[in-house]
Structure formats: structure tokens, C-alpha cells
């Protein structure tokens, strides 16, 4: 059969299963004159043979674990034994069968875990090896917990990563493990090959003893610190402790205060660094963080609460230099004249801010002293002895002492005696007629002037006029300002007029005094006036229901998914057409009728979130007026970025020859979102054979160490491939390359002879 089992001499690759006795020839090479015979060289291991006529075969079962690839060369010779064709490469790939069982590297493992450790964070790895090909199911290992002892309430506290053998706590384990209740656990772990999927898989078991240790990384009790402390600072106020020595502590001020008066030392002791002022800030909340030597957080931050205790360090303050009240001539005993309200910056509802009022002087003392009294705690002034007469004394001045438990302050009150309020305000017109305005009349515009007069004493509360709209303006679109000299009222627009909701408003004004009317006198129809406001329609732009619309979706939503919607209404009731503006990434489309927004392309949080576009609502018909609102699309992260090296690692070298195995540290990162504690990568070598020369070990969630397994390296560059898995959902893996050069060194640097190639590294390890 020409082609499959026979043919001319050319480079070829054959795949043969290991462990099988030879049952057929591999290939029959055909000689082209002047070639008459064939010769086989290379990695024959006395298994591969070629007969002179070109029949290539093997004479006993192959073993992939001894050699996975046999690189052979076949040459064609002429009658004189001279090579006339080739040699050509013939590659024999030995295909794996499951002829090796997995074995754990240790029959017993021991580890410890801290209570409340983060679920899913590995604290121990079990490791098994299988000589079979890891690229096939034969060498693919599957780890499982067979039993957990003790098992409380049938709840598993531990879990194992089926692929990596990483043991970690479950959510329940993180919450419930307590060394006071149960300080130790035992796990039986099994490992199977065939990915655990076959009845014919081989397996092994190991035992894991786990000690549970106490977690002392706990938030301390809230601290109370008295303000204005005169003790020498800094003063220790509390402490935190990481579970192991060597942590680096820091404080995080989430409030971004201009003055942050706390510090932490490397023992975890927390200090206040300067006196606090409760009146400036009465409580602080900040966070204590513990980090490892690489600056990575070791755990969640602890919340520290500091309450500032008040001392009486503020005197009462008067509301103004002089407080003016008015009292009518005929007012009766006990009538309220007004209330003096002093302030105290100390803590409310405590003795430090509780105020007492006392009249210390009245001038003049005519017709007698003690005409007024003040309520001790309320500060309300009352008429105490008799009605007052303006012609005798038109003005009194009171000095009032306001005190808290330590401080006294004097406040001054002027009491003006005014004529009795026996005249009501009278409008000069009872009806101000009709007024027609466009609905887009500017806010602040004066639209009408009204006037009432009052015959009481001028420039007193008895004659001062306040105008109120008591009917026809429930929305509060209008207001009235009074000129205190003329009592003229100016009707102004306070809120936009609206033809659609109030085309005609029948407005009623009331004119009244700030002082009460004397007994027996009442406001009547003369104190009321009306007018009619007619609002005309203006074609207005559509109005969005919100200034900013916000929606939240996962960055991996399918194209065509509805991601949000916007709504606008046209005041005139016209239909609206929606469109998008500023969709720079071309991610979105909007249904021009409904305002629903859909994705039209893959979204990417890492390109920027939130994604901000403008939505435009345009009238259909009419004058096509439009208005604009914002649509913010918040993209929630999915694990869609594989890990990569955090920086460029060209330039790593070891001085050749190595005197002892060496190592170097590298850092990984990825572009996905990570919670406070950062990524948790796992590291392994990128191909099975690299394990003969190299070893990779995890330092923490982002750093790993690449070490040489021996010292017998050539003086040359090696490119080491490393797999980095982010452990996400789904887990993503990146293969990165670390170029490492072994070179002759002079004074710790790579020696480069003149004219040597550029690019040889210059950073030693």
C-alpha cells in the first residue's frame, strides 16, 4: 500500500503506543537509484532496526517513560556505502498508555490553618506524581477528600482543588472552625488518574493532619478619647496584632481627612498623635491593614472606631450682638415677647451645653424694675408686672446672663414698645384682574405689584405687612416680596409656570401683620385681594424622567441583551424618538420608540466602567425639539483576562557555572477586578520536561520563585515557560516566558566580549 506503509525517503513522524509487542512494520522505504541500501542512526536504543532493503521496524515493546520521542535518521547509501540521500529525520512519538499509578509524594501531610481564614485560600498542597503523559488522561490527576474527621453536623469544613491538590476552607469552615472547640482534624485524600473519570483509573491515598490555630486578627473594642488632652502625645489608644510576626501595619483613612491624627507602629500599636477636638469631629472610623513583605494585604482590614468625648470647652454664644423684640402697649401680663436662643458648641443634651437664662439688668427701671421675666431654661421673655406705655418709656434694654455649668455669657436684648395693633391692612384694590404670561417666563420675573396700607404706627410690627398667597397656587410657583419701607408687594415667579398642568390660576392674596391684632379686631375682606393668572402654551422640549440613568450588567452579556432603558415625556404629548450620542465604543443601540438600550458588541469592563453615553429624546413632528440625558452603564467584572507577568523580565541571569542552585522572584498580575486582598494566582511549569531542571514555588497570591533544580546548566540562554492560573470562575490560565541567561560574570555582571550580540541581560540573580 503505497503512501501509508511504504514510500520514498523523506522526513516522517510515526506514533506508536508503548507497551505493545511489535505486530507490524513501521515503514518500507523505497530506494531511488543509485541508492541501494538504507542505514539507521540516532536514538535507536537497539529497539529500532532498518533492514538493508529499507524495512523499518521495532523489535520489542516501547516505554514512553524511558523515552517519549526517538529521533532517528535514515540515510540511503549507494553500492559503495556512500550516502546519496538524507539523512532525513524520522521521529517516533511514543504514545502513552495508563501503565503507571499515581503516588503521593508523602504518605502523611501535616498543616495548620487559622480560624476565619478566607474560604478557598489554600493553606496546604498535597502532591502526587504519575509517570504517564500529563497531556493525556493517563497522567491527569484528580484529587478528592474521602473523609473528614471529625465531621460535625455533616458539614465539610475543608475542600480540595481537584486539579492542583490545594486544600482550603469551605465557607462553613471559615465561619465555624474554632480551636477552643476542636483543635485538630484529619483528612483522607485520594488521587486518581484518568482525570478521575474512568473505572479503570489507578489511585492512591494519603492522610492529612490539620491543626486549627486561633485568629487574633480581630477588630478591637471602640475607643473613647477625651478631647483637648494635655498629656504628651502620641498616646497609645488600642492595638491590633497579625497572627504571625513580621507583618507590616498601616492605617487607611477612608474619609480622606485633611488632618489624620492617628498612627500605627510595627508592633500594631495604634496611637493618637495630637489632641482631638470634638467640635471639629466627634468620631473617627479608619482601618488597620496588615501586609506581607511584598506589600500584599494578609487579610481583610479591621475597622477601628474612636469616639471623642466632650469636655465643657465652649461658652454659650448670643444669637446676635443685640436681639430686638417688640411689645404692644396694651399687651397683657404673661404674654410672650419673644425667645432668646443662645448656642453652645459642646455636645447636645449634656450638662456641657445645657443653658440657663437670667435677667441681670433692666434699663430704664421705669416705672419700676422687674417688668420682664425670662424662663430659666427656655429663654422665653414675658411681660411680668404690667402693661407698658410708649409715651412713658418707648424702649427697654435688658442684659441677660446665659450660663452653662462652667461659663457665663452676657447677651443684650432691646424691647421696643409699639402702638397697639388695632388697624388691619387694607388692599387698595380687591381684584387685580387678569394677567396672561407665556409658560417659559423667566424665574425671578416680577409679574404684578400689589399694595395694601395699615394705619398703625409706621415701621413697627403692627403696620408692617406680610403678603401670603392663600389660594390658587398649591404648587408654590409664585411668591410675594414686601418692600419694608412702602409695604408694596412684588409678585414674582419662583418655579416654572406650566400650561399643561395649570393654564388658569385664580390667586387669592392675604395681607397680615407680624404682630397680633388687639383683642376684638379681626382681618376681614379688605385684607384680601385676587387676580387671575392665565398661562399660554410654549412648545417645550421633551423632559427625561431622570438627569442620569444608570444600569448595571455583567461585562460578558450576550450581544443583543437589554442593558437598560430611558424614559422621557413631551409636555405637549407628542411622540418621542430616542437616539444615542457619544457611543464611542459602538457598544450600544437604542430602540427609538421604547427607549430600551441593547448591547450590539462585546462589552469590556477593563476598557472602562462605567461606560457613559448621552441619550437624546426628540419630538416627532412639531418643531423637533430635543433634550439630552446621561446613561451610565456599570460593567460588573467577569474573569476574562488571563494572568501575565507584571513587568518585563528581560535581563535575568545567573553567573556560570552555578556554585549552588539559584532562584529568582517574579510577579504576576491580570486586568480583572480583585477584591481588597488582591489576586490569588497558582504557578506551575509550562511543560513536563521543564521539571527536570526547574522548580516554581508560590510565595503569595502574586509572587512566585523560580529555582534551578541543579547546577549543571550550559552557558546560554534558556526560556522557561510558566503557567499561571488565576483560580477565578471560570479559571483562566496564562503561559508566560522568563528568559534566563547563564553567563560568565565579571564582578557580578554578565561578561560580554567585544562585538558580542546585543540584548544579553545585565541583571544578576
Amino acid at each position: 500500500q503505497e503512501g501509508k506503509f511504504s514510500g520514498p525517503l523523506k522526513p516522517m513522524t510515526f506514533s506508536i503506543y508503548e507497551g505493545q509487542e511489535p505486530s507490524q512494520i513501521i515503514f518500507q522505504f523505497k530506494a531511488n537509484p543509485p541508492a541501494v541500501t538504507f542505514e539507521l542512526t540516532g536514538e535507536t536504543d537497539n529497539i529500532f532496526v532498518i533492514e538493508r532493503e529499507g524495512l523499518l521496524y521495532y523489535n520489542r515493546a516501547l516505554d514512553r517513560e524511558t523515552r517519549s520521542t526517538h529521533n532517528l535518521q535514515v540515510a540511503a547509501l549507494d553500492a559503495n556505502g556512500i550516502i546519496v540521500e538524507g539523512p532525513v529525520p524520522i521521529t517516533i512519538k511514543v504514545k502513552d498508555i495508563n501503565d503507571n499509578r499515581p503516588t503521593f509524594l508523602q504518605s502523611k501531610y501535616e498543616g495548620s490553618v487559622r480560624q476565619n481564614s478566607r474560604p478557598g485560600k489554600p493553606f496546604l498542597y498535597v502532591n502526587a506524581t504519575d509517570l504517564d503523559d500529563p497531556a493525556t488522561p493517563n497522567g491527569q490527576l484528580y484529587y478528592q477528600i474521602v473523609i473528614q474527621l471529625p465531621m460535625i453536623n455533616n458539614v465539610m469544613y475543608f475542600q480540595i482543588n481537584n486539579k492542583t491538590g490545594a486544600i482550603s476552607l469551605t465557607r462553613e469552615g471559615s465561619q465555624e472552625l474554632n480551636p477552643a472547640k476542636n483543635p485538630s482534624y484529619n483528612l483522607v485524600i485520594s488521587v486518581k488518574d484518568m482525570g478521575g473519570q474512568s473505572e479503570n483509573s489507578f489511585s492512591d491515598t494519603t492522610s492529612v493532619d490539620i491543626i486549627v490555630t486561633e485568629n487574633i486578627w480581630k477588630a478591637p473594642k471602640p475607643v473613647e478619647m477625651v478631647e483637648n488632652s494635655t498629656d504628651p502625645h502620641p498616646i497609645k489608644i488600642t492595638q491590633v496584632r497579625w497572627n504571625d510576626p513580621g507583618a507590616q501595619y498601616s492605617l487607611v483613612d477612608k474619609e480622606k481627612l485633611p488632618r489624620f491624627p492617628f498612627s500605627i507602629d510595627q508592633e500594631g500599636d495604634i496611637y493618637v498623635t495630637q489632641p482631638l477636638d470634638r467640635e471639629e469631629k466627634d468620631a473617627y472610623v479608619f482601618y488597620a491593614v496588615a501586609k506581607d513583605e511584598y506589600g500584599k494585604p494578609l487579610s481583610y482590614p479591621l475597622e477601628i472606631h474612636v469616639k471623642v468625648k466632650d469636655i465643657n470647652d465652649n461658652p454659650p454664644t448670643c444669637p446676635s450682638p443685640v436681639t430686638v423684640f417688640e411689645v404692644q402697649e396694651n399687651e397683657r401680663l404673661g404674654n410672650s415677647i419673644g425667645t432668646l436662643t443662645a448656642h453652645d458648641r459642646d455636645e447636645e443634651n449634656t450638662a456641657n451645653s445645657f443653658l440657663n437664662y437670667r435677667i441681670v439688668e433692666q434699663t430704664p427701671k421705669l416705672p419700676m424694675d422687674g417688668l420682664f421675666l425670662i424662663q430659666t431654661y427656655a429663654g422665653m421673655l414675658q411681660l411680668a408686672k404690667q402693661s407698658l406705655k410708649k409715651q412713658d418709656t418707648p424702649q427697654y434694654n435688658l442684659t441677660i446672663e446665659v450660663s452653662d455649668k462652667d461659663f457665663k455669657t452676657l447677651c443684650f436684648v432691646q424691647i421696643n414698645v409699639i402702638d397697639i395693633n388695632d388697624q388691619i391692612p387694607i388692599f387698595e384694590k380687591s381684584d387685580y384682574g387678569n394677567l396672561t404670561l407665556a409658560e417659559d417666563t423667566n424665574i425671578g420675573s416680577t409679574i404684578l405689584t400689589i399694595q395694601a396700607t395699615d394705619a398703625d404706627e409706621p415701621f413697627t410690627g403692627s403696620s408692617k405687612i406680610l403678603y401670603h398667597i392663600i389660594k390658587g397656587d398649591s404648587e408654590g410657583r409664585l411668591g410675594v416680596d414686601t418692600d419694608p419701607h412702602t409695604n408694596t408687594g412684588y409678585v414674582i415667579i419662583k418655579k416654572p409656570l406650566d400650561f399643561e398642568t395649570a393654564a388658569v390660576s385664580n390667586i387669592v392674596f392675604k395681607a397680615e401683620n407680624p404682630e397680633p391684632l388687639v383683642f376684638g379686631v379681626k382681618y376681614n375682606a379688605s385684607s384680601f385681594a385676587k387676580f387671575t393668572l392665565i398661562v399660554t402654551d410654549v412648545n417645550e422640549a421633551p423632559q427625561f424622567s431622570q438627569h442620569v440613568f444608570q444600569a448595571k450588567v455583567s461585562e460578558d452579556v450576550a450581544i443583543g441583551t437589554k442593558v437598560g432603558n430611558v424614559t422621557a415625556k413631551d409636555p405637549e404629548g407628542l411622540d418621542i424618538s430616542y437616539s444615542l450620542r457619544g457611543d464611542t465604543r459602538g457598544w450600544l443601540k437604542i430602540d427609538h420608540v421604547t427607549g430600551e438600550i441593547f448591547s450590539v458588541a462585546p462589552l469590556d469592563r477593563e476598557a472602562g466602567s462605567p461606560y457613559r453615553v448621552q441619550v437624546v429624546a426628540t419630538e416627532v413632528g412639531g418643531s423637533s425639539l430635543s433634550s439630552v440625558s446621561e446613561f451610565h452603564l456599570i460593567l460588573m467584572d467577569v474573569n476574562d483576562n488571563p494572568p501575565r507577568l507584571a513587568k518585563d523580565y528581560t535581563g535575568l541571569f545567573f553567573c556560570h557555572p552555578l556554585s549552588a542552585p539559584g532562584s529568582l522572584i517574579f510577579e504576576a498580575t491580570d486586568d480583572d477586578q480583585h477584591l481588597f486582598r488582591g489576586p490569588h494566582f497558582t504557578f506551575s511549569l509550562g511543560s513536563g520536561s521543564l521539571q527536570n531542571d526547574w522548580e516554581v514555588s508560590k510565595i503569595n497570591g502574586t509572587h512566585a520563585r523560580l529555582s534551578t533544580r541543579h547546577t549543571e546548566f550550559e552557558e546560554r540562554e534558556y526560556v522557561v515557560l510558566i503557567r499561571i492560573n488565576d483560580g477565578g470562575r471560570p479559571p483562566l490560565e496564562g503561559i508566560v516566558s522568563l528568559p534566563v541567561t547563564f553567563c560568565s560574570c565579571v564582578e557580578g555582571s554578565c561578561f560580554r566580549p567585544a562585538g558580542h550580540q546585543t540584548g544579553i541581560p545585565t541583571v544578576g540573580m
Epitope: T69, P89, D133, S689, L690, V720, I735, V736, S737, P739
Partner: nanobody
Framework: EVQLVESGGGLVQAGGSLRLSCAAS????????AGWFRQHPGKEREFVAA????????RYADSVKGRFTISRDNAKNMLYLQMNSLKPEDTAVYYC???????????????????WGQGTQVTVSS
């Protein structure tokens, strides 16, 4: 399993250019390191160029540096070798290669590559 098929070889005059292509089938061209070797008649296979896909960095034999450029198109599953300023000593069979599980770090050794194409003949006449 990866199958590699080279094309683009041929006869060219000294100083001329050729572009070799290598199509990967069987699975995506996911090998972290892919490259080109060549074999002169009666000689051992010799490293020409390698492309380390993880960082996009390249390595070249001193004899071809500045004249040859290796590149890949992941979307099309293709590896290329652009050969300029060709010399008669570049005459050889050129093989496309990709790493598998036997890779040990020495990217310029034939034994490091599990997957080989059948080769394409490049002849440079003077």
C-alpha cells in the same frame, strides 16, 4: 495532535526574498514556542528562529539575524518566516516546529520540539 504543513519554498537568486508559511491543524497553534529549523544536506538540523508567543519576543540564529523575521497570525493559525537578502548558504530544507511537553528551556535545540512539519526546500542560486 498538531500537524504542521510548510509552504513557500522554492528557487530564488542570491539577494532575493522568500516568505515561508506554516499552517497548523489538528488544534489551534497554542504551543507557547514555535519556530523554524533547517537542515543542509548531510548535516544536523540547525536552529533558525523562534517566536515566544507569551511575550511576543523572538530569537534568531546569529547567521540569519537582521535578515530573517519570524511572525505568527493566531487568528489564522499560521507561522511565517520572512527571508530577505538570501545567500547561497541559506539553501536547505526548512522545517516548521512547535513545542509540546518535552520542552526544557533550550529553544534552539531540535529535541525541545515535539511537533515537526515535513519540510519545504529553499534553494538560493548564486
Amino acid at each position: 495532535e498538531v500537524q504542521l504543513v510548510e509552504s513557500g519554498g522554492g528557487l530564488v537568486q542570491a539577494g532575493g526574498s522568500l516568505r515561508l508559511s506554516c499552517a497548523a491543524s489538528g488544534r489551534t497553534f497554542s504551543s507557547p514556542i514555535a519556530g523554524w529549523f533547517r537542515q543542509h544536506p548531510g548535516k544536523e538540523r540547525e536552529f533558525v528562529a523562534a517566536l515566544i508567543s507569551t511575550g511576543g519576543s523572538t530569537r534568531y540564529a546569529d547567521s540569519v539575524k537582521g535578515r530573517f523575521t519570524i511572525s505568527r497570525d493566531n487568528a489564522k493559525n499560521m507561522l511565517y518566516l520572512q527571508m530577505n537578502s538570501l545567500k547561497p548558504e541559506d539553501t536547505a530544507v526548512y522545517y516548521c516546529v512547535a513545542t509540546g511537553n518535552t520542552y526544557r528551556g533550550a529553544y534552539d535545540r531540535p529535541a525541545e520540539y515535539d511537533f515537526w512539519g515535513q519540510g519545504t526546500q529553499v534553494t538560493v542560486s548564486s
